[in-house]
């Protein structure tokens, strides 16, 4: 699917903004009048909703934050414009719960369905004499099965909410003014502090800092990172080493250990938190590879770990090689996904930033057009991706990376060998059958690995419904550190890929992400998308979410534009 559209935006079948005529098959169009076709606001034909449909039944649901409908009948709504509805009623004698499909354009029990586009059925109280009456409507599969009476963002009185906003808005004006003043003062203090830090790094002004072109100076670092951007992408050639105090060990890899550390400033109390990657003497080659990659000023990007400097250090244990970078407290993506379930919005941010980071790495120019050496990572995996405070990704660990220098010969490329982590290796890497004539082949292996990481993110997203414990790709099929041979069995012999359960596809955005990652892990490297294309697709997703004006964090779709018609 989508092979002819690999380098574009969403394939046509994913873009919702098509005309009706182009969406209905010609052989069906002939006999269908347009008034029988139901479309969404953008002209996409709608699939019908799947809803619980038990009409009115007695219920035991009372004084609870949420209840299950206990309705065993799921119906395909007769008309595709219909949404799921639940009505809870309590009078002196009994409690009833009604579950139905209904057209939101028509009142139900004399009330308009205001929340029909919501993915959840959040009950709102309605005024009915002689009884307590709650109603909700929603637009995701069987969403009226779980009826919610209490949600943080729910209010039973929208008018009251408006009054609260108005009152708090007016009363907050004076403190808001004070707050803005404080921020400005703090900003000035920070700028002054950053300049002091820069001078610490300069040691006698013997070193000129590399600069961005003035037309393109963009601050790309994490907005909560303490590192001065002026310090980035430098090799510390001075004999005087930075005043760094190692704190705790935060990670251990094949070649090095990573420490959280304090970079001291002029006064002993002040420090910046940094990360220090320490390579033992024997791993000089890995340190040099990563140092050389990081030394390229054009590599600087918000989704690539911010590099500060590299140092050679003599200790009582012998010579060590240090890389000093920004520190990200949330840790790596694998740890983060193990500990946290993520929302749809988080998934979009994490996925988008990952794709942008890889696209920048692969690109032969910077965002502002300066020539740049394309780089392939060759060991992309969730433990080599850091999560920043704003819940975006940045790539790290370039120890196996390769600069795609146009002067490299096929022999040079061949000598780079089968590198990476077996679990994340593309089929052609496992098979050692890469097309070395084409440097794009290296990028295509990164894209395959990226697809597996996107799958990991999706597997922990609560917008799909039930979320299982974190499991790495192929987690149920291979042991913890699989060898190349066992991955060959899975990926080459069985053409296996991580499972995409069908219920993930109930969410429109996640369906798009799944379509994308499926194209990224295609067996045929040529058929895979580019990282840039994936980044553009994520931008498109954000655009679609904004256009439809929904809170995208958990939006589910009835599953797709669907077609049902009046009978």
């Amino acid at each position: 699917m989508g092979r002819g559209l690999l380098r574009g935006l969403w394939p046509l079948h994913i873009v919702l903004w098509t005309r009706i005529a182009s969406t209905i098959p010609p052989h069906v169009q002939k006999s269908v009048n347009n008034d029988m076709i139901v479309t969404d606001n953008n002209g996409a034909v709608k699939f019908p909703q799947l809803c619980k449909f038990c009409d009115v039944r007695f219920s035991t649901c009372d004084n609870q934050k949420s209840c299950m409908s206990n309705c065993s009948i799921t119906s395909i709504c007769e008309k595709p414009q219909e949404v799921c509805v639940a009505v809870w009623r309590k009078n002196d004698e009994n409690i009833t719960l009604e579950t139905v499909c209904h057209d939101p354009k028509l009142p139900y029990h004399d009330f308009i369905l205001e929340d029909a586009a919501s993915p959840k059925c959040i009950m709102k109280e309605k005024k009915k004499p002689g009884e307590t009456f709650f109603m909700c409507s929603c637009s995701s599969d069987e969403c009226n099965d779980n009826i919610i009476f209490s949600e943080e963002y729910n209010t039973s009185n929208p008018d009251l909410l408006l009054v609260i906003f108005q009152v708090t808005g007016i009363s907050l004006l004076p403190p808001l003014g004070v707050a803005i003043s404080v921020i400005i003062i703090f900003y000035c203090y920070r700028v002054n502090r950053q300049q002091k830090l820069s001078s610490t790094w300069e040691t006698g002004k013997t070193r000129k800092l590399m600069e961005f072109s003035e037309h393109c100076a963009i601050i790309l670092e994490d907005d909560r990172s303490d590192i001065s951007s002026t310090c980035a992408n430098n090799i510390n050639h001075n004999t005087e080493l930075l005043p760094i105090e190692l704190d705790t060990l935060v990670g251990k890899g094949r070649f090095a250990e990573v420490y959280k550390a304090k970079l001291k400033q002029n006064t002993s109390e002040q420090f910046e938190t940094v990360a220090v990657k320490i390579f033992p003497y024997e791993e000089y080659a890995s340190w040099k590879t990563e140092k050389d990659i990081f030394s390229d000023i054009n590599l600087k990007h918000e989704n690539i770990l911010q590099f500060l400097t590299a140092e050679e250090r003599k200790t009582e244990l012998g010579k060590q090689y240090w890389l000093i970078t920004a520190f990200h407290a949330k840790g790596n993506l694998q740890e983060y996904l193990t500990r946290h379930v993520i929302s749809w919005e988080d998934l979009r941010k994490l996925g988008s930033s990952l794709a942008r980071g890889i696209a920048h790495l692969h690109s032969d120019h910077t965002p502002c057009g300066r020539p740049k050496m394309p780089i392939v990572h060759r060991d992309l995996k969730s433990s080599n991706i850091l999560v920043k405070n704003d819940l975006t990704c940045c790539l790290c660990d370039f120890g196996l990376s390769l600069r795609l220098d146009p002067t490299l010969s096929v022999d040079d490329l061949a000598n780079s060998g089968q590198v990476g982590t077996a679990r994340y290796m593309a089929p052609e890497v496992l098979e050692s059958r890469m097309n070395l004539e084409n440097v794009e082949s290296f990028k295509q292996t990164d894209v395959y690995s990226m697809a597996l990481v996107l799958w990991e993110m999706t597997s922990r997203c609560n917008a799909v419904g039930e979320v299982k414990d974190y499991e790495p790709p192929f987690g149920s099929k291979v042991r913890e550190h699989p060898c190349v041979e066992s991955m060959k069995d899975n990926v080459l012999r069985d053409r296996g890929r991580p499972e995409i359960p069908s219920f993930w596809l109930n969410h429109q955005g996640i369906q798009m992400v799944c379509e994308t990652l499926t194209e990224c892990w295609d067996h045929d490297p040529e058929a895979r998308l580019t990282a840039q294309c994936v980044a553009e697709r994520f931008s498109e997703l954000e655009h679609l979410d904004r256009l439809s004006g929904r809170s995208c964090s958990e939006e589910k779709i009835p599953e797709d534009g669907s077609l049902n018609t009046t009978k």
Partner: nanobody, 116 residues
């Protein structure tokens, strides 16, 4: 390229049975909900039945509940519709459809005629 090919239609007497098949190719079949949709002569489209990607969940329109059974064989990339106790009003062209974000993945349809 996504392809869906329906077969199994034909002329049957009221009360009779038919089994429709839909052979799918060009996409990862197991990842998608699939639908059977029908269109009676001069009428609109009616969604008959749906089945989840793994086949564990099935859904039916009220008009066919208890008479039709949807199933799938993911190893063969094939969708089925077993139709029993057929009625004259079941006469229609039956299409299988891949659940997706637009409406371009349909087969050519197979005609089912229920008549005595």
């Amino acid at each position: 390229e996504v392809q869906l090919l329906e077969s199994g239609g034909g002329l049957v007497q009221p009360g009779g049975s038919l089994r429709l098949s839909c052979a799918a190719s060009g996409f990862t079949f197991v990842n998608y909900r699939m639908w059977w949709v029908r269109q009676a002569p001069g009428k609109g489209l009616e969604w008959v039945s749906a089945i989840s990607g793994s086949g564990d969940k099935t859904y039916y329109a009220d008009s066919v509940k208890g008479r039709f059974t949807i199933s799938r064989d993911n190893s063969k990339n094939t969708l089925y519709l077993q139709m029993n106790s057929l009625r004259a009003e079941d006469t229609a062209v039956y299409y299988c459809a891949k659940h997706g974000l637009s409406f371009d993945y349909w087969g050519q349809g197979t005609l089912v005629t229920v008549s005595s």
